[in-house]
């Protein structure tokens, strides 16, 4: 991937939408919308001052991460709905879109330097540990996935991107 | 001891201008966020936006983007909020206060501005 | 914009519980804030973070927030309560989001 792709706003913006969609899809869904177990997902939420102070390095560990438990609850996700007896097609498609779009994710802030970032800093090895939710239905588990995207990863790479023009 | 020290009461006329200030003593003014919040006669409390006096970088409100301007003077540790063209919808109390991990944890005593013709 | 709906007023005897809401679409996924406003006097941080109290506040104190709803409760009421009380979040963005406060009266 082009090392700097995902500092054009509409990249985010397409797997954002494809998030909220996936969101919307499942509001209201109870039948087929229960994942069957507890599954470990990041936390999200935002203390924005707090996460503006920290040291991009830092910054970089939590969105790795967060990307990495995420894409493994979700991969968790999918393989939940292939053996269920019965699997709602559009839950299908969405679950799939995700990882794909994770996965694209993954790749696109490996190019910008994330991974590197992420190892580097001094103080990774003392970072604090991944704060942590557990999601029991598809709808759970697409807003996190949404709200990860929409909050650390969006502001990471909004402050990744700036410093790297510099 | 944090202390925020705002700028005296202003009585203006429709159409004036205005800056007042607010100066940060007992912490490192840099280190730390100030943010703006109005709160009109009777009224609640409304954010008008944060500054990050070591970055420069401001955020406003939608509701008091274009309305009014902050900035910061770091070598002085003093932020102000400043307004162009002062309407009598303006009249309020306005507060200063550090933006910490513990958002608006300290605050400044508050400067009345009148706004009548 | 985001918008933070709270009660206008709750009432409450001396030494009950009194519990104020603040709601707000999906606050649960942000976090909640809450200040103490007395008559006159500049609003006071009481809780942070939705269940952390900065230091000086009572243990009485305390708060929570999922789904819709952030709750700021307040057990063993005293005369010295009675206040306004404000919930406030971040977004993602990084607006500072007020509600509309809430009269505690104590009987």
């Known amino acids: 991937a082009p090392p700097r792709l995902i500092c054009d706003s509409r990249v985010l913006e397409r797997y954002l939408l494809e998030a909220k969609e996936a969101e919307n899809i499942t509001t209201g869904c109870a039948e087929h919308c229960s994942l069957n177990e507890n599954i470990t997902v990041p936390d999200t939420k935002v203390n924005f001052y707090a996460w503006k102070r920290m040291e991009v390095g830092q910054q970089a560990v939590e969105v790795w991460q967060g990307l990495a438990l995420l894409s493994e609850a979700v991969l968790r996700g999918q393989a939940l709905l292939v053996n269920s007896s019965q699997p709602w097609e559009p839950l299908q498609l969405h679950v799939d879109k995700a990882v794909s779009g994770l996965r694209s994710l993954t790749t696109l802030l490996r190019a910008l330097g994330a991974q590197k970032e992420a190892i580097s800093p001094p103080d990774a090895a003392s970072a604090a540990p991944l704060r942590t939710i557990t999601a029991d239905t598809f709808r759970k588990l697409f807003r996190v996935y949404s709200n990860f995207l929409r909050g650390k990863l969006k502001l990471y790479t909004g402050e990744a991107c700036r410093t790297g023009d510099r | 001891e944090v202390q925020l020290v705002q700028s005296g009461a202003e009585v203006k006329k429709p159409g004036e201008s205005l800056k007042i200030s607010c100066k940060g003593s007992?912490?490192?003014?840099?280190?730390?966020?100030i943010g703006w919040v109005r709160q009109m006669p009777g009224k609640g409390l409304e954010w008008m936006g944060w500054i990050d006096p070591y970055r420069s970088e401001i955020r406003y409100s939608p509701s008091f983007q274009g309305q009014v301007t902050i900035s910061a003077d770091k070598s002085i540790s003093t932020a102000y909020l400043q307004w162009s063209s002062l309407k009598a919808s303006d009249t309020a109390m306005y507060y200063c206060?550090?933006?910490?991990?513990?958002?608006?944890?300290?605050w400044g005593q508050g400067t009345l501005v009148t706004v009548s013709s | 914009s985001y918008v933070l709906t709270q009660p206008p007023s709750v009432s409450v005897a001396p030494g009950k519980t009194a519990r104020i809401t603040c709601s707000g679409d999906?606050?649960?996924?942000?976090?909640a804030y809450w200040y103490q406003q007395k008559p006159g006097q500049a609003p006071v941080l009481v809780i942070y973070d939705d269940s952390k109290r900065p230091s000086g506040i009572p243990e009485r104190f305390s708060g929570s927030n999922s789904g819709n709803t952030a709750t700021l409760t307040i057990s063993r009421v005293e005369a010295g309560d009675e206040a306004d009380y404000y919930c406030?979040?971040?977004?993602?963005?990084?607006?500072?989001?007020f509600g509309g406060g809430t009269k505690l009266t104590v009987l």
């Open positions: 007992g912490y490192s003014f840099t280190s730390y966020w």
């Open positions: 999906k606050l649960g996924d942000h976090y």
């Open positions: 206060a550090r933006v910490s991990s513990e958002p608006f944890d300290s």
């Open positions: 406030a979040t971040w977004t993602f963005e990084g607006d500072y989001v």
